[in-house]
Interface confidence: low
């Protein structure tokens, strides 16, 4: 009775199981009643990461500069290349296809993230005491201004984009 | 735009060996497989072979022991050798290039019919 | 190998007609490894539909594909005069790759 079903690692073909090519590996022939599966190892550009019977190799993944692309892991015959954003970009996707620059944090926002290779600016609305005044993509909201320990007092009250202006005390005649 | 161009004898002896030559122009042969196709006098289509950039073959099981496909890098070019020709092996021979991962076939050159009589 | 059945050898229609062409794998194969092939006299084939159901480059939108596992067909919706060819189904899933015998798509 042939089999209908394999064990793990083995395929079924012409009413038999073969056994799958390893990782890194690529089926050049399926087995015979007489012969083992035949397999070769991917080339220096190629790579295949599971038990396989595919036959060919795929490419490893290119990490185009002209898309601000470099590599960040070099991929074997197991893995693929991986690839990040240049510094100041971050990844468009999850498969890092293409990079765009970080966004900045407009005035009244600060950052609350730096970017990395792949993932943007966080920006937060800077709260009551805080503020920016600058469009960033590194800058975190800073505080006001403490008029009292510089022995002032608040001539104009700060916002979230703007600093409070401090100004000497009024003497009493 | 990639455009590919057969060329070689367009008569070939019993038992002798046939030879093909695929020109590829509009882009470097570097980076994909290239493969041989033929078609029999009104029948159907049957894949010889293909061969990666690097020179790594694929051979169908049933001409394998007959083919042999190389290539050129500096010249942008790819050959099929098939020996020990008959009358079944007269047909348009048509070179190609395969897509990325798969083997199928976005660009193909325009054929050249070789008939196998002596 | 895995086999590819073509199914009808022949098909009769006139323009504006809906063709159905159906191609069946001795083995079940993954939609992704999957094409579809269109061949008129004297020219090479052109790669129409590839993973079972997506279009080539510059290929009109009244070719569909669809299917999974060993039951493929290739559709096209309003034929037009230029669409009467051979139509050919290939796998490369398995090794080596191959091809159905072909559907012929002719003028009624």
């Known amino acids: 009775e042939p089999p209908t079903a394999c064990r793990e690692k083995q395929y079924l073909i012409n009413s038999q199981c073969c056994s799958l090519c390893q990782p890194g590996q690529k089926l050049v022939s399926d087995c015979t009643e007489f012969t083992e599966t035949e397999c070769l190892p991917c080339s220096e550009s190629e790579f295949l990461d599971t038990w396989n019977r595919e036959t060919r190799c795929h490419q490893h993944k290119y990490c185009d500069p002209n898309l601000g692309l470099q590599v960040q892991q070099k991929g074997t015959s197991e893995t693929d290349t991986i690839c990040t954003c240049e510094e100041g970009l971050h990844c468009t996707s999850e498969s890092c296809e293409s990079c765009v620059p970080h966004r900045s944090c407009l005035p009244g926002f600060g950052v609350k993230q730096i970017a990395t290779g792949v993932s943007d600016t966080i920006c937060e609305p800077c709260p009551v005491g805080f503020f920016s005044n600058v469009s960033s993509a590194f800058e975190k909201c800073r505080p006001w201004t403490s008029c009292e320990t510089k022995d002032l007092v608040v001539q104009q009250a700060g916002t979230n984009k703007t600093d409070v202006v401090c100004g000497p005390q009024d003497r009493q005649r | 735009q990639v455009q590919l161009q057969e060329s070689g004898p367009g008569l070939v002896k019993p038992s002798e060996t046939l030879s093909l030559t695929c020109t590829v122009s509009?882009?470097?042969?570097?980076?994909?497989?290239w493969s041989w196709i033929r078609q029999p006098p009104g029948k159907g289509l049957e894949w010889i072979g293909s061969?990666?950039?690097?020179?790594?073959?694929n051979y169908n099981p049933s001409l394998k022991s007959r083919v042999t496909i190389s290539v050129d890098t500096s010249k942008n070019q790819f050959s099929l050798k098939l020996s020990s020709v008959t009358a079944a092996d007269t047909a348009v021979y048509y070179c190609a290039r395969d897509a990325n991962y798969y083997k199928w076939h976005p660009y193909w050159g325009q054929g050249t019919l070789v008939t196998v009589s002596s | 190998e895995i086999v590819l059945t073509q199914s009808p050898g022949t098909l009769s229609l006139s323009p504006g007609e809906r063709a159905t062409l159906s191609c069946r794998a001795s083995q079940s194969v993954s939609s992704d490894y999957l094409a579809w092939y269109q061949q008129k006299p004297g020219q090479a084939p052109r790669l129409l539909i590839y993973?079972?159901?997506s279009r080539a480059t510059g290929i009109p939108d009244r070719f569909s594909g669809s299917g999974s596992g060993t039951d493929f067909t290739l559709t096209i919706s309003r034929l037009e005069p230029e669409d009467f060819a051979v139509y050919y189904c290939?796998?490369?899933?398995?090794?080596?790759?191959?091809f159905g015998g072909g559907t012929k798509v002719e003028i009624k």
């Open positions: 993973g079972a159901s």
């Open positions: 509009g882009g470097s042969i570097s980076s994909y497989y």
């Open positions: 290939q796998q490369v899933l398995s090794y080596p790759p191959t």
């Open positions: 061969i990666y950039y690097s020179g790594s073959t």
